[in-house]
Amino acid sequence: RGVFRRDAHKSEVAHRFKDLGEENFKALVLIAFAQYLQQCPFEDHVKLVNEVTEFAKTCVADESAENCDKSLHTLFGDKLCTVATLRETYGEMADCCAKQEPERNECFLQHKDDNPNLPRLVRPEVDVMCTAFHDNEETFLKKYLYEIARRHPYFYAPELLFFAKRYKAAFTECCQAADKAACLLPKLDELRDEGKASSAKQRLKCASLQKFGERAFKAWAVARLSQRFPKAEFAEVSKLVTDLTKVHTECCHGDLLECADDRADLAKYICENQDSISSKLKECCEKPLLEKSHCIAEVENDEMPADLPSLAADFVESKDVCKNYAEAKDVFLGMFLYEYARRHPDYSVVLLLRLAKTYETTLEKCCAAADPHECYAKVFDEFKPLVEEPQNLIKQNCELFEQLGEYKFQNALLVRYTKKVPQVSTPTLVEVSRNLGKVGSKCCKHPEAKRMPCAEDYLSVVLNQLCVLHEKTPVSDRVTKCCTESLVNRRPCFSALEVDETYVPKEFNAETFTFHADICTLSEKERQIKKQTALVELVKHKPKATKEQLKAVMDDFAAFVEKCCKADDKETCFAEEGKKLVAASQAALGL
């Protein structure tokens, strides 16, 4: 059934080429190569992909042909290692090529860079883009795959094919429209924002698998799928979890052809077994493959079955708890998580996992006690504070968001997080705090029953961005501790951090607060980022500054930018008024 139906194949590359078709094969190989060699020029990657594709075709024609029996890692790794400038461009990554599989692939994976030193993608004029699209549609779309893949080395490859399909559709439609820009730009903005979100969500899945292991990922998947498919039986959910784990393990491991193939099989299985999974899948299952897989991944939670019995009966009141636990610990805990999650679509996945962990810890202790039943009888009472903590936090933060609006809410978080972990780089603090702040507009509009799963699971994704960026250049023991101790307790760990009293304030540098006329031509978003960067630097200089002091300085700063951007001689205004602002700010903050 499902994802594991295939027999062994003489040639893996031929098998995948036939399963996926030439177009998807080429696209996935390009993504794989761009995610490994993130600095290589587009033309070099296209050349490598064409060579691999030609080779795959020879294997399709004759599976016994030379080298066709080699593993995909061997074939792709050998191809990547032919790049002439590997040592100059990638330094020690070139040492990977001296290794044998599977160590070589592991080595390439370890060198993936979450924050590659690449120029920001600048969007050309609409007419320029449309001309490029019409001149060579294939190259235009390949370039999109390449640019996204190299900047997001863990992007979920089959989903990137779906984004590329939408990207193509946008250009096909809008380049013929009367007002090309009005048609195209909102679509591109939507794709960009959805793409960033998709990349971040997948990055958390890969971090979960790579840093915390398969068991952690499976627990997450049991909880999420049980919320989504509450009518499905436990065995069905367990089967879906196993197949989904295989798909994500493959994609996170760089096995993109196998991943895309298995994801298609999983979608097929789910649609063939809708009746025993969910009543919400009908529309998804009528769509073409890429849309179908995406739709299933985003499908709304099915209605909970009526009259589900109390959880306490099987998991607390029963005298058989320890016996059932001893019979198969992980299965029993899996059933607990399934039963709890399907009854609680109003809880975040991470909360459900905290409850399951608490339950497991209690059973480990109590099942070795003299009177196990008496020992675990009150286990559900231990859940109450765990449930209330995120509920209260979300309530407080949504109130703050509604009072301040997104920009000022982000600023409040910038100050809060800079005080917690001032050693973290300013760009990372700005990026992460801005994203944390978006939780307000994303989740606070929801009714109570949807707020927690929206907010806390989103925060897990954002804090993972902080964790992966920090891992590249670790500067704070507190960040390392919160990121590595427990996947499900990352958010509570960061929430519990107080001001870092050990931090030695940064030396004042006037250059940091010197602004020029170019700020006036920036978009509103870019201008906000400039101001927020200054705010972080202010807090790093004066961690003990009060909210009132910081607000006064930021208000002055906003007025200064507005005034100089209206001035005739902008540059002179920025130079003269800027000096005054710096002096006034230093005085206001006692610097």
């Epitope: 196993t242 016996k323 019979e327 198969a328 992980d330 899996g334």
Partner: antibody, heavy 119, light 111 residues
Framework: EVQLVQSGAEVKKPGESLKISCKGS????????IGWVRQVPGRGLEWLAI????????RYSPSFEGQVTISADKSISTAYLQWSSLKASDTAMYYC????????????WGQGTLVTVSS | QSALTQPASVSGSPGQSITISCSGI?????????VSWYQQYPGKAPKLIIY???KRPSGVSNRFSGSKSGNTASLTISGLQADDEAEYSC???????????FGGGTQLTVL
């Protein structure tokens, strides 16, 4: 130190009854399932039955349901396997095992009891 | 008739690697990695060498490793030694309220 000590070898005639034992020590006997495994000479291992000494709940492999009885006395940390009427085909080595975390994982084993049934 | 299928015998020379397969694992056992491997010398009790598909009990050599793909588990022994010659059996969880199942056993011969 965890130990499972089984009773000695038995030679019996067809139709006779028999009860062999497995005494556990060095751990909380009531908190782990105990399983009995059969090995006919020259053949593989077979799970016969399991018991949870905490409440004496039992499970039997379909092939052995009604052929053997598993029991336990938690007061003396001992599990038993018994036959009411032995057959020549019951000739085998019988092992008991402590099952840890899941009933397919025997982490400690008895030394084995050889049962020979012959007329 | 075993619910799990293993090859009756495998052989290898000292220093080589061998792999023994065990197919027919139930979906639930596969989902929760509930597969164990045992080594047994003639006249001796079985010894647990792998549990939960890939984990080794303390004291077991790291030359023994386990893996799983679909409904088939595998035991790999690398750097084969003469004293690896023994019978190897897999066992898997068979579902709630059920007794576990064994494979038929595989006799490993070191040439």
């Amino acid at each position: 130190e965890v130990q499972l000590v089984q009773s000695g070898a038995e030679v019996k005639k067809p139709g006779e009854s028999l009860k062999i034992s497995c005494k556990g020590s060095g751990y909380s006997f009531t908190n782990y399932w105990i399983g009995w495994v059969r090995q006919v000479p020259g053949r593989g291992l077979e799970w016969l039955a399991i018991i949870y000494p905490g409440d004496s709940d039992t499970r039997y492999s379909p092939s052995f349901e009604g052929q053997v009885t598993i029991s336990a006395d938690k007061s003396i940390s001992t599990a038993y396997l018994q036959w009411s009427s032995l057959k020549a085909s019951d000739t085998a080595m019988y092992y008991c095992a402590r099952l840890h975390g899941v009933v397919s994982r025997g982490d400690y084993w008895g030394q084995g009891t050889l049962v020979t049934v012959s007329s | 008739q075993s619910a799990l299928t293993q090859p009756a015998s495998v052989s290898g020379s000292p220093g080589q690697s061998i792999t023994i397969s065990c197919s027919g694992i139930s979906s639930l056992a596969g989902s929760y990695n509930l597969v164990s491997w045992y080594q047994q010398y003639p006249g001796k009790a079985p010894k647990l060498i792998i549990y939960e598909v890939t984990k080794r009990p303390s004291g077991v050599s790291n030359r023994f490793s386990g893996s799983k793909s679909g409904n088939t588990a595998s035991l790999t022994i690398s750097g084969l030694q003469a004293d690896d010659e023994a019978e190897y059996s897999c066992s898997s969880y068979a579902g709630r309220n059920a007794v576990a199942v064994f494979g038929g056993g595989t006799q490993l011969t070191v040439l």
